[in-house]
Interface confidence: low
């Protein structure tokens, strides 16, 4: 329904904590380099230009779109050209043309410092002095950062964050309170921002009867007694709610999401046995909830797929009648059933399925020819279920940092020509997936496994995208999002690459690495062995292990030496030497 | 472009009869539930009729049971209400509605909606 201010009907939609928690991410998405201060008082000043409009809906300028309001917001900034370029040039523009215009010019990868979380003390002192401005600093810092993360699901990671500073900070020891803690929000955060931004190319580069074929998969899985009626209705309204984040339109989409928590709550007959305990908690909880909530029973009495899809005579007429609609019955008959195959397997089976009916239903005899399409399934099943068990077989052999190595090493034979920081980034999010899925129970392996390493990959194929050097990865990346990972298990070593010169400057340390947190040491010794992969990439596993427990041992002695200096000095050379006869 | 265009409206008296017609363009309704609803001036929109695309499974509010039938004929791509015994309260504009295969409980179950055509009962 149509309302006179759009503005208005948001903010009393969504309350104002919420509504400008919401302005700012937007803002922090868009204008990345932005200050907080900068945002804060931009945001201010939208939430009270919202405040005269529901006071007044036909006050002046309250009839306009968001788009237009906001952006002219930004658009007024002062220095925008020197601080973000081009996209100054988007000012010059009309909505919706303008907003399109910002959208592209979103980086995935901004040059901006890692997030630094500050000490305890530090960190209560000023959430006790300002809780709302330290939350609106979390919010900041993370969008401008993730600049796709889902917004409404960031002021849930917010919330929590906000939960544990006032359970900690209230605590004798605060530092061991917060560090555990924190740590898991912030995991699960990244892993929420790489899923989203998969469901944001998704929709980008495949529209939304993609997203809506993916929606419409994982609803089935979860939600195996809901009809196929309800799925599609589900699908269509998620599809919406992420069409709107994914396109800088927060407010509607926090809105909307609200709206279809509500809507699951209260046709849970219909929907799910298993959303009660989501249904009792607060908004930004019940949606979060609701978003992984386990799968429901699957009905005991399910027919064989084949009956309707394979035996039936009429499928070909079916089929003709109404592609998409046939199609989407499949996708959800087969999801319900199999809640252990991965999202994109799925969606790969029925991608198989559609291509059969069409080359099939042309032919003077179609059943005859779509009656083995189920036995063709068989290797698209098989191939991921292979990938799991050997990844998760040398992940349980190895432990996380060893498999990040492990794939580090295939990753960088792949793809030599890909930027070592990109590499090493890739290698360690690929090897999180061991300590993530496979010690999960066998049936949600697969999966587990494959949907997070299908999003990991399209971060490397974003960063890819902006430089592009290699032919591997851009093969890869211009398939559909479905083949993606697939086609970067297939990939062997690179053999038009000419390996790298040794540089000794690229293999010699110095004493600083030995006060490294953990992680900063990894990577450090995780970008020397892509160097060396570099260097030399048919370089065997045995020559590469002897080379890293050298440079292990190496460290591990000069950290402990009492003259750190001299030790890294005078034994670094011996270690490049060693290294490049182990390799030689 | 998908869309539902309803027909067949007017005044009548009370105790006569009408019957609306749905018709679909830009998809067939093989594979669509359609549901006719009613909003009277000043009242929320109300479920009052609905026909499963099989044809098999049909439904209807209470107020209208024994008055009103649903139908369909797919070859015209066009679901039926016929109305009887029409009543002054059975003023209203009613709007066809096209769901996926069943037919919704709720008014937001459904995906596609026309643009409505007036009934008016009076004397």
């Known amino acids: 329904e149509a309302h006179k201010s759009e503005i208005a009907h948001r903010y009393n939609d969504l309350g104002e904590q919420h509504f400008k928690g919401l302005v700012l991410i937007a803002f922090s998405q868009y204008l990345q380099k932005c200050s907080y201060d900068e945002h804060a008082k931009l945001v201010q000043e939208v939430t009270d230009f919202a405040k005269t409009c529901v006071a007044d809906e036909s006050a002046a300028n309250c009839d306009k779109s968001l788009h237009t309001l906001f952006g002219d917001k930004l658009c007024a900034i002062p220095n925008l050209r020197e601080n973000y370029g081009e996209l100054a040039d988007c000012c010059t523009k009309q909505e919706p043309e303008r907003n399109e215009c910002f959208l592209q010019h979103k980086d995935d990868n901004p040059s901006l410092p890692p997030f630094e979380r500050p000490e305890a003390e530090a960190m209560c002192t000023s959430f006790k002095e300002n809780p709302t401005t330290f939350m609106g600093h979390y919010l900041h810092e993370v969008a401008r950062r993730h600049p796709y993360f889902y917004a409404p699901e960031l002021l849930y990671y917010a919330e929590q964050y906000n939960e544990i500073l006032t359970q900690c900070c209230a605590e004798a020891d605060k530092e061991s309170c917060l560090t555990p803690k924190l740590d898991g929000v912030k995991e699960k955060a990244l892993v929420s921002s790489v899923r989203q931004r998969m469901k944001c190319s998704s929709m980008q580069k495949f529209g939304e009867r993609a997203f809506k074929a993916w929606a419409v998969a994982r609803l089935s899985q979860t939600f195996p007694n809901a009809d196929f009626a309800e799925i599609t209705k589900l699908a269509t309204d998620l599809t919406k709610v992420n069409k709107e984040c994914c396109h800088g339109d927060l407010l509607e989409c926090a809105d909307d999401r609200a709206e279809l928590a509500k809507y699951m709550c209260e046709n849970q007959a219909t929907i799910s046995s298993k959303l009660q305990t989501c249904c009792d908690k607060p908004l930004l909880k019940k949606a979060h909830c609701l978003s992984e909530v386990e799968h429901d029973t699957m009905p005991a009495d399910l027919p064989a797929i084949a009956a309707d899809f394979v035996e039936d005579q009429e499928v070909c007429k079916n089929y003709a009648e109404a592609k998409d609609v046939f199609l989407g019955t499949f996708l959800y008959e087969y999801s319900r059933r199999h809640p252990d195959y991965s999202v994109s397997l799925l969606l790969r089976l029925a991608k198989k399925y559609e291509a059969t009916l069409e080359k099939c239903c042309a032919e003077a005899n179609p059943p005859a020819c779509y009656g083995t399409v189920l036995a063709e399934f068989q290797p698209l099943v098989e191939e991921p279920k292979n990938l799991v068990k050997t990844n998760c077989d040398l992940y349980e052999k190895l432990g996380e940092y060893g498999f990040q190595n492990a794939i580090l090493v295939r990753y960088t034979q792949k793809a030599p020509q890909v930027s070592t920081p990109t590499l090493v980034e890739a290698a360690r999010n690929l090897g999180r997936v061991g300590t993530k899925c496979c010690t999960l129970p066998e049936d949600q392996r697969l999966p587990c496994v494959e949907d997070y390493l299908s999003a990991i990959l399209n971060r490397v194929c974003l960063l890819h995208e902006k430089t592009p050097v290699s032919e591997h990865v851009t093969k890869c990346c211009s398939g559909s999002l479905v083949e993606r990972r697939p086609c970067f298990s297939a990939l062997t070593v690179d053999e038009t690459y000419v390996p790298k010169e040794f540089k000794a400057e690229t293999f010699t340390f110095h004493s600083d690495i030995c006060t490294l947190p953990e992680k900063e040491k990894q990577i450090k010794k995780q970008t020397a062995l892509a160097e060396l992969v570099k260097h030399k990439p048919k370089a065997t596993a045995e020559q590469l292990k002897t080379v890293m427990d050298d440079f292990a041992q190496f460290l591990d002695t000069c950290c402990k030496a009492a003259d750190k200096d001299t030790c890294f000095s005078t034994e670094g050379p011996n270690l490049v030497t060693r290294c490049k006869d182990a390799l030689a | 472009e998908v869309q539902l265009l309803e027909s067949g409206g007017g005044l009548v008296q009370p105790g006569g009869s009408l019957r609306l017609s749905c018709a679909a363009s830009?998809?067939?309704?093989?594979?669509?539930?359609i549901g006719w609803f009613r909003q009277a001036p000043g009242k929320e929109r109300e479920g009052v009729s609905c026909i499963a695309s099989s044809g098999g499974s049909t439904n209807y509010a209470d107020s209208v049971k024994g008055r009103f039938t649903i139908s369909r004929d797919n070859s015209k791509n066009t679901v039926y209400l016929q109305m009887n015994s029409l009543r002054a309260e059975d003023t209203a504009v009613y709007y066809c509605?096209?769901?996926?295969?069943?037919?919704?409980?709720?008014?937001?179950?459904?995906?596609?909606w026309g643009q409505g055509t007036q009934v008016t009962v009076s004397s």
């Open positions: 509605a096209a769901a996926v295969l069943e037919c919704r409980t709720v008014v937001r179950g459904y995906d596609y």
């Open positions: 830009g998809f067939t309704l093989d594979y669509y539930a």
